[in-house]
Amino acid sequence: NKILVKQSPMLVAYDNAVNLSCKYSYNLFSREFRASLHKGLDSAVEVCVVYGNYSQQLQVYSKTGFNCDGKLGNESVTFYLQNLYVNQTDIYFCKIEVMYPPPYLDNEKSNGTIIHVKGKHLCPSPLFPGPSKP
């Protein structure tokens, strides 16, 4: 038996930040679980991890180069990614493992979310501004 994961197909990070919500066909309340976010088509780079159990506060881990926070819902984990760079535009996959209570469960691979990080285009100040008006 596998957990199903739903993600938005695409998100645009206009201000270098994005909320990626991973929705599961499973209630995480009073469970020990490890939710993770993976970058790239081959899911090679794990960038963020949320660990939760029934007796402790949620623990969030961010890989170097990523600024990540996590929020838990009954059937979801939302990853809040900040300070994203344009070159971090990629497809991101949510994964979930539930360890306790048995049986161990993990998810069917999701379709992923393309996160498009838009660069900040600041208007350059003119080199030779005209005379200021009184």
Epitope: Y61, E97, M99, D106
Partner: nanobody, 124 residues
Framework: EVQLVESGGGEVQPGGSLRLSCAAS????????MGWFRQAPGKEREFVAA????????DYAESVKGRFTISRDNAKNTVYLQMSSLRAEDTAVYYC?????????????????WGQGTLVTVKP
């Protein structure tokens, strides 16, 4: 809950070698990292080396690069630290740590569980 048991510490002469082991037991996820930290008397616990589950990501403190090698046997849930060319300044209690992060983290705060420590003494 994860339990960690270290072994392999002892006394060795400068230039000598030791291999530390750390066996993890308890509920394991498919991805986690383990690392070694050390604490000399009167000093903070400092990062030595770490390795992820897939063994494709390892990190070392500058002071041990080229002398120490971290490895792991996933079938045994065990991580090893091969230490060679040991120096007096390597004398410390070596602690094994476990983190739910899936990368070789050097951040002490990322580690959730610790072993009891094993003493390494380097002296002539």
């Amino acid at each position: 809950e994860v339990q960690l048991v270290e072994s392999g510490g002892g006394e060795v002469q400068p230039g000598g070698s030791l291999r530390l082991s750390c066996a993890a037991s308890g509920r394991m996820f498919s991805n986690y990292a383990m690392g070694w930290f050390r604490q000399a008397p009167g000093k903070e616990r400092e990062f030595v080396a770490a390795i992820n589950y897939r063994r494709d990501d390892a990190d070392y403190a500058e002071s041990v690069k080229g002398r120490f090698t971290i490895s792991r046997d996933n079938a045994k849930n065990t991580v090893y630290l091969q230490m060679s060319s040991l120096r007096a300044e390597d004398t410390a209690v070596y602690y094994c740590g476990f983190t739910y992060a899936g990368w070789a983290s050097s951040g002490r705060d990322d580690y959730n569980y610790w072993g009891q420590g094993t003493l390494v003494t380097v002296k002539p």
